[in-house]
Every structure is written in structure tokens, then in C-alpha cells.
């Protein structure tokens, strides 16, 4: 007797973080024996979508013409062959940005910092939120979460860095979110350029690459120091 059907591969183009109103295509790739593909969204009351395979039958396309809150979430796909349904794919997390107004990102005391000193990036939202994310451009592991304890709402989160090295230099943005759906993020803050001076080593430009690629040493998440900020937020690493 044959073993379970191999699981399909699930991915999104142009990516899994999509701005409100933009289009996204979800692809599910199975085998040439596939007769039907099914996309399931976590905690949905019914299959999210079902599609016939595209020739040569080894994949299916699920189109989202305009990204809205409805589509943000965690997906898996399956394919059906003559012997039954496959194992589920690994999950795909589809995140929508633009759900809330953009926060403000600033550097204290200044975005120009000397190597070895300390700097704190401050993400502030107009309305109280319970999750803040700091993202460094072109980092393989860009997300640093600060999430409030017990759902307490905050207007800001602090991301301290100490001691600063050339690795910390670069462009940052932050997002805010509500805990009831971490698949819905605010518009991104305006970019903040953190410039590290006085370093003996020349800062190397980080190569442009997608979030899914392996991390190099310059792409490690910022390691915060000291105690949890007074804002009542807890640190979570992605």
C-alpha cells in the first residue's frame, strides 16, 4: 500500500506581506496526478477556495484581486488525486498592511550614533495599540515584536540598542497592530535612517534579498539590552 501523498508547496506572489487594495496570487504546487486543489484558511467555516489544476496539473492559482482584511490569515493547501487528498502544505501567513494609520518612528537621542554608544528607536502610534513591530530593510529576519502584557494598549514602544555597531546601521520602519489579528498591520512608518559613525570597520551594504533566504551575520535581529521597557510591553522575537 502506498504511503500518504506528498504535501504540496504553497507560496504567494509577489510576497506574503501585501498592502491593502493590492493584488496577490497564491500558488499551490502538487503533483501531475492532481485532480483538484483546495485552499483552507485557518478557522474558516468552509474551504476558502477550490480550483482545478492548471496544465500540466501540478499546480493551481488562487487569485486575490484586491487585498482586504478578509484575506489576511494563515493558509494551507491540499490536492486531490485518484487515491484521495494529500497531506497539508506547510502554512502560508498572508499579512495585510494598511489596516491602521501609520506610526511615527524616531531615534533617541539621535539617528546619528557613534559606534559603541546606545540608541533607542521609538515607535509611536496615534491610537493605542498592543503590538509594535520594528523592521530593518533587507534583513533576513526583520521582525522584532513588542507585545503588551494582558492586552494593555500602548501608544508607543521602545527598541533599545546597546552597544551600537556598524551592523545596526540601515533603514528601519515600524508597524503597529492589534492583538486580535497579528495578520493585520498598520501602514508602515516613514523610514528612519540610522547612521553609525566612528567605526573602524567599513559598513558593508546588506545584499537585497527576500525574507525567506538564509541570514548572514549582518542580518541577525537586533539584540535588545536591559530590562523590558516601562511601557508594559513584552519582547517577542520572530
Amino acid at each position: 500500500q502506498a504511503g500518504p501523498l506528498p504535501k504540496p508547496t504553497l507560496w504567494a506572489e509577489p510576497g506574503s506581506v501585501i498592502s491593502w487594495g493590492n493584488s496577490v496570487t497564491i500558488w499551490c504546487q502538487g503533483t501531475l496526478e492532481a485532480r483538484e486543489y483546495r485552499l483552507d484558511k485557518e478557522e474558516s467555516p468552509a474551504p476558502w477556495d477550490r480550483q482545478n489544476p492548471l496544465e500540466p496539473k501540478n499546480k493551481a492559482r488562487f487569485s486575490i484581486p484586491s487585498m482586504t482584511e478578509d484575506y489576511a490569515g494563515r493558509y494551507r493547501c491540499y490536492y486531490r488525486s485518484p487515491v484521495g487528498w494529500s497531506q497539508p502544505s506547510d502554512p502560508l501567513e498572508l499579512v495585510m498592511t494598511g489596516a491602521y494609520s501609520k506610526p511615527t518612528l524616531s531615534a533617541l537621542p539621535s539617528p546619528l550614533v557613534t559606534s559603541g554608544k546606545s540608541v533607542t528607536l521609538l515607535c509611536q502610534s496615534r491610537s493605542p495599540m498592543d503590538t509594535f513591530l520594528l523592521i530593518k530593510e533587507r534583513a533576513a529576519h526583520p521582525l522584532l515584536h513588542l507585545r503588551s502584557e494582558h492586552g494593555a494598549q500602548q501608544h508607543q514602544a521602545e527598541f533599545p540598542m546597546s552597544p551600537v555597531t556598524s551592523v545596526h546601521g540601515g533603514t528601519y520602519r515600524c508597524f503597529s497592530s492589534h492583538g486580535f489579528s497579528h495578520y493585520l498591520l498598520s501602514h508602515p512608518s516613514d523610514p528612519l535612517e540610522l547612521i553609525v559613525s566612528g567605526s573602524l570597520e567599513d559598513p558593508r551594504p546588506s545584499p537585497t534579498r527576500s525574507v525567506s533566504t538564509a541570514a548572514g551575520p549582518e542580518d541577525q535581529p537586533l539584540m535588545p539590552t536591559g530590562s523590558v521597557p516601562h511601557s508594559g510591553l513584552r519582547r517577542h522575537w520572530e
Epitope: 467555516p45 468552509a46 476558502w48 477550490r50 487528498w85 486580535f180
Partner: antibody, heavy 122, light 109 residues
Framework: QVQLVESGGGVVQPGRSLRLSCAAS????????IHWVRQAPGKGLEWVAV????????YYADSVKGRFTISRDNSKNTLYLQMNSLRAEDTAVYYC???????????????WGQGTLVTVSS | DAVVTQESALTTSPGETVTLTCRSS?????????ANWVQEKPDHLFTGLIG???NRVPGVPARFSGSLIGDKAALTITGAQTEDEAIYFC?????????FGGGTKVTVL
Amino acid sequence: QVQLVESGGGVVQPGRSLRLSCAASGFTFSTYGIHWVRQAPGKGLEWVAVIWFDGSNKYYADSVKGRFTISRDNSKNTLYLQMNSLRAEDTAVYYCARDVISMVRGVPFDYWGQGTLVTVSS
Amino acid sequence: DAVVTQESALTTSPGETVTLTCRSSTGAVTTSNYANWVQEKPDHLFTGLIGGINNRVPGVPARFSGSLIGDKAALTITGAQTEDEAIYFCALWYSNHWVFGGGTKVTVL
């Protein structure tokens, strides 16, 4: 046109069993999920259970979990509800209602049957 | 267990706009509750109106629309007709089960 016809209702004593059927026509039964919903005399609607198009997923209301079983036979275009350990509070008109092909295509509870009355009484 | 609450009754006049709401005891109604609206006419004739991902059942007039207003789901009848007199039930999804509200009796005088 879409038709859902329930049958199998009647009077039954507490603790006994009953099996309801829902015969579907006018649409491709095997591509749709189907619900059971009930309405006690003079009351509102209470959702009972749903089964996906291929039977792969089944969900139940807490009030019937462990006592009722939803199933389907796609070759016969028929939905079933096996009701065991019946209680007086299960007395209601039981309706089957069509679910969706998928969430992005269709609306849950779009078509309903006329219902079959189940009375649980000693 | 979640309780879904609706207005017990609303009265409107032909041509007027009426909004029915659906509140969840667990907090704000969100898109993840997939709010659904069902109409009951006399003799227990049930028809789905709106649900899923903002879908309207084919054949349902465009004057019926669903939305989220504040922390509640809403059904708006824009330009009510006498034939819209009925009981309207909302249903909300909670991860693995549906819960119906108690229904709103709409009278069109």
C-alpha cells in the same frame, strides 16, 4: 431549481435515537457543504452541525456534540443526522441548509428545506 | 459560550432605510466571524441573504447590504419594500461553530 427535502422526524422517547435525512436536488450536491439547523417551538434558530463537501470536516454545536453525528452519501445526494440519547430540549423543527462551495464562492445558508419536526417526549 | 444579540423588533416605512445590527458577547464582530444574514418569511420559509466574503445570494435585491459598523455586524435595507417584512437572523462563526442571534422582526408599515 435547488431543493432540499428533510424526512425522518417524529415522536421519540427521551434517550432513544432517530435518523434524519435530507434529499438534495437541483445542484451538484457533492460540491457543497450542508448544515443542520433547528428551531424549537416559538424560539429562534439554533445551528446544529455542518459537513464539508467531501465529508472531510464536521463541526457541531456544543449542545449536541457526542450525541449527534452528521454524515453524507454523495452518490445518493443525501445528508443525514444521526441523533442519539435524545432529550426533551432537542424537540424542534430540523432544517437542512446549503453551505458554500468555498468561502469566496457562495453564501452559507443560502437555500433551506421545509423542515421535519422532531418531538422528544415520554 | 458566545451569545449573539439582535434588536427584537424594528419598524420602518416603505422607501425608508433601516439598519439591523448583530452584537457578539465575546467582543467586536470582525471579518473572522463571517457574519451571515437569513430571512424568515411566514410559514417558516428561510432564505439566505448575505454572508461569506461580502457575498449576496443571487437573486437577492441590491437594497440588502451587509457591513461591519463599529463593533457590530449590520444588515441595511435601503429603500424598504412591504415584501421585506420578515424576521431577520444573523449568524456568526466562532472558530469551529456557528451561533445564530435571536432574530429581528422587521415591520414595514
